[in-house]
Amino acid sequence: ARNGDHCPLGPGRCCRLHTVRASLEDLGWADWVLSPREVQVTMCIGACPSQFRAANMHAQIKTSLHRLKPDTVPAPCCVPASYNPMVLIQKTDTGVSLQTYDDLLAKDCHCI
Amino acid sequence: ARNGDHCPLGPGRCCRLHTVRASLEDLGWADWVLSPREVQVTMCIGACPSQFRAANMHAQIKTSLHRLKPDTVPAPCCVPASYNPMVLIQKTDTGVSLQTYDDLLAKDCHCI
């Protein structure tokens, strides 16, 4: 169960979807991808305070134990809950192909 | 594709499964769980250096962009790749029940 969406740290500080513009060179793809030349990469960034967007029971446990043992147990982490597919025009041995990747762009985020 | 399992930071420093002993009180479960009194919580802890146990393409992108923009893009994070189920004897309005939880104990870990 997705828990509270209210960020106690202030607007935009907690785990949410961000867009980062990146070139093929930035991504290290220039040698095998032809297009797009630039990608609007959606990724999950932000803090995961107590019970904020807790993905599951494990995240809730992690929050509790982090409170008790902050040096041993890290806080939950902001990661993709699901992905949007994306196509790349990529080089092959014989030319090019259009390839779909299902795990490239974050669609929404949760804490785990 | 799960990438390299060699930790460049030294043995045990990178993302892996850890066991943390926790009481019902530690977990905040004392008011609704009867048994077990103590749980061996398995969780994912450790650093995620470049391409170490990268869960998918998104994790690889995150590594590349973190290297370029460390203040904007965080490094990948060590999270469960799968879970082991666990049963709890929990209090109900009428007595107790045996309930299985599928998302409580980490089974193995990856970086995302």
Epitope: S35, N84, P85, M86, V87, L98 | -
Partner: antibody, heavy 118, light 107 residues
Framework: QVTLKESGPGILQPSQTLSLTCSFS??????????VGWIRQPSGKGLEWLAH???????YFNTALKSRLTISKDTSNNQVFLKIASVDTADSATYYC??????????WGQGTSVTVSS | DIVMTQSHKFMSTSVGDRVSITCKAS??????VAWYQQKPGQSPKFLIY???YRYTGVPDRFTGSGSGTDFTFTISSVQAEDLAVYYC?????????FGGGTKLEIK
């Protein structure tokens, strides 16, 4: 596998609006980088690109025809629509829709024939 | 708009011959030219991307080259099934534009 199929009225009269539908399967218009384009071909002549629409709803049009063209999509039903206003006999052609991945048009429909006649 | 010109409307060749079709852009399009094949009664088929990259499944007898304004599409050994019209298209900028087509006839 990827398939596209165009449908239209077949025959219509000058000054009417031509409405075309492209129904497709095997890909999704919610995928980053994917679009659907419309191209036409008058009988015995060459290809003319008309318009395309992207996954993010960005739209591009043939310069000469821009004022008469409308393109839209229904992502959940895998359909793209093209409307051409105020048709005349010069709009008689076979109309194709094609799947696009960025600047590749790799799969084309079989085409639908449109005749404008009074 | 960028104008794509295929100077030969028709080209005649024999099975086994090498044939080259040219296409000229009205301005520099870098390598952003695609080639399509349209057989009689069929829809166009995508062959070449970005001047020289063969698309998945396209036989290796089909090649493309060129950059800037001058582009060439070559069939190294013509087969009977290559009877078709071949179109170049610039994908450098919208509006995308096609050449007028070159009809390959088999002697």
């Amino acid at each position: 596998q990827v398939t596209l199929k165009e449908s239209g009225p077949g025959i219509l009269q000058p000054s009417q609006t031509l409405s075309l539908t492209c129904s497709f399967s095997g890909f999704s218009l919610s995928t980053y980088g994917i679009g659907v384009g419309w191209i036409r071909q008058p009988s015995g002549k060459g290809l003319e690109w008309l318009a395309h629409i992207w996954w993010n709803n960005n739209k591009y049009f043939n310069t000469a025809l821009k004022s008469r063209l409308t393109i839209s999509k229904d992502t959940s039903n895998n359909q793209v629509f093209l409307k051409i206003a105020s048709v005349d006999t010069a709009d008689s052609a076979t109309y194709y829709c094609a799947r696009m991945g960025y600047d590749i048009m790799d799969y084309w429909g079989q085409g639908t024939s449109v005749t404008v006649s009074s | 708009d960028i104008v794509m010109t295929q100077s030969h409307k028709f080209m005649s060749t024999s099975v086994g011959d090498r044939v080259s079709i040219t296409c000229k852009a009205s301005q520099d399009v870098n390598t952003a030219v695609a080639w399509y094949q349209q057989k009689p009664g069929q829809s166009p088929k995508f062959l070449i991307y970005s001047s020289s990259y063969r698309y998945t499944g396209v036989p290796d007898r089909f090649t493309g080259s060129g950059s800037g304004t001058d582009f060439t599409f070559t069939i190294s050994s013509v087969q009977a099934e290559d009877l078709a019209v071949y179109y170049c298209q610039q994908h450098y900028s919208t509006p995308w534009t096609f050449g007028g087509g070159t009809k390959l006839e088999i002697k």
